[in-house]
Amino acid sequence: AQNITARIGEPLVLKCKGAPKKPPQRLEWKLNTGRTEAWKVLSPQGGGPWDSVARVLPNGSLFLPAVGIQDEGIFRCQAMNRNGKETKSNYRVRVYQIPGKPEIVDSASELTAGVPNKVGTCVSEGSYPAGTLSWHLDGKPLVPNEKGVSVKEQTRRHPETGLFTLQSELMVTPARGGDPRPTFSCSFSPGLPRHRALRTAPIQPRVWEPVPLEEVQLVVEPEGGAVAPGGTVTLTCEVPAQPSPQIHWMKDGVPLPLPPSPVLILPEIGPQDQGTYSCVATHSSHGPQESRAVSISIIEPGEEGPTAGSVGGSGLGTLA
């Protein structure tokens, strides 16, 4: 069979070889397509409900005014010329539709090096057959599941038109110290050969390199966190980061209802002030960072000072 590729919605003419150019003609077209069950016979004197889909022209050719997905299949013509010689024509028709230019939607303007990031979603609408989407970095194909690259794909079919919508979501983990402005693009490759790929406009997100965080230091005065009843304890949260982050305070793992401040003063210490304290620094560019914990405890007169309060871990200090 001769392979014919036709674009959806376009007309198609299939020649019936050996047919006399004008009536009377002894010919018959048989088709087995998505519109038929087994074979449907069309003759020159036909004409009727099938005319919207396929009809025999005066010269014996079969005319399809606007091919559709259901017209994919086999078309055969059997013709006899004036001398009684029989000729057969056999066609396999496949249809295609080129989608609109693919687009990258929900694209990221900034990526963070060293962690997985969603770059964007590539969308292609109105293809047949489905075809495929692929991603490119600086013009080179990106291979999923390699070097921190992952792709999530989805294919949907329109219930009425039968055309496909493809979606491909790209996730990447940029290497530290890599290209600060990588160029990503996406391309649609048709399911039928001989049609070139369609490529999106490129996107160029910035890659942000997170600065390794320095530890949040919690300084306690008096050192060791043990104080006589009625004494004062000063807790200072030191964060080297710029700009200065917001500092909140925790006691026994519960946030204290105080305005943000790098210094917490506990005057006139009483039994209710005993516990484990820490500070939490919240940066605009990364998540919250918690300091080590210190135990604040009360020492009765006669007890040895600094050794009575333990520092760090989850030490509860010495109870009076």
């Epitope: 409900p49 099938w50 919207s52 889909v53």
Partner: antibody
Framework: EVQLVESGGGLVQPGGSLRLSCAAS????????MTWVRQAPGKGLEWVAS????????YYPDSVKDRFTISRDNAKNSLYLQMNSLRAEDTAVYYC????????????WGQGTLVTVSS | DIQMTQSPSSLSASVGDRVTITCRAS??????VNWFQQKPGKAPRRLIY???NLADGVPSRFSGSRSGTDFTLTISSLQPEDFATYYC?????????FGGGTKVEIK
């Protein structure tokens, strides 16, 4: 609203003529073939005529061929049936319906208009 | 011309009954058969298209099937509003041919 509305029915003498109209609304008229179907009093349904979406091709059963003419005006979203040489057996309710080819066949109907051929 | 022989021409049934109406085509018409419902004084309404497909807005108790040139309309559980006349139509070839109709009446 998607609808078809027929008009033009009435009483006519045998041998006379009548023109039926069908006004379409709520859909893209020129995407569809259109068809006329009739129903004689107390009888079943009978196909009368079909026309393709461009109006270039028309189709009739032998019972009305050469007497009836189906036409359309896509600019006016209208379908017509010109009936000449009317006979008593043409007495029926005439329905206009959307479709007429293998893709869409009579999926939407008008309310019908009565044609009475009598002396 | 293709003949569509519809049977029975009438039937009496009760609400809740399963009802089956058959049309036999005189030659192969593929899947190109529709079923219609018509109530007195009203226009027909398409129920089933291309032998087996339920038209929009039609209750799921209606179904269509095909075996060769035999086409069947089934109402799984007859409802009061289903008492009407039913027609099949072949549209594989001209002239388009309707079956003679089946009147479904209350027993």
């Amino acid at each position: 609203e998607v609808q078809l509305v027929e008009s033009g029915g009435g009483l006519v003498q045998p041998g006379g003529s009548l023109r039926l109209s069908c006004a379409a609304s709520g859909f893209t008229f020129n995407n569809y073939w259109m068809t006329w179907v009739r129903q004689a009093p107390g009888k079943g349904l009978e196909w009368v005529a079909s026309i393709d979406n461009s109006g270039d091709n028309t189709y009739y059963p032998d019972s009305v061929k050469d007497r009836f003419t189906i036409s359309r005006d896509n600019a006016k979203n209208s379908l017509y049936l010109q009936m000449n040489s009317l006979r008593a057996e043409d007495t029926a309710v005439y329905y206009c319906a959307r479709g007429g080819d293998i893709r869409v066949m009579l999926d939407l109907w008008g309310q019908g208009t009565l044609v009475t051929v009598s002396s | 011309d293709i003949q569509m022989t519809q049977s029975p021409s009438s039937l009496s049934a009760s609400v809740g009954d399963r009802v089956t109406i058959t049309c036999r085509a005189s030659q192969d018409v593929g899947i190109y058969v529709n079923w219609f419902q018509q109530k007195p004084g009203k226009a027909p309404r398409r129920l089933i298209y291309r032998a087996t497909n339920l038209a929009d807005g039609v209750p799921s108790r209606f179904s269509g099937s095909r075996s060769g040139t035999d086409f069947t309309l089934t109402i799984s559980s007859l409802q009061p509003e289903d008492f009407a006349t039913y027609y099949c139509l072949e549209f594989d070839e001209h002239p388009l041919t309707f079956g003679g109709g089946t009147k479904v009446e209350i027993k």
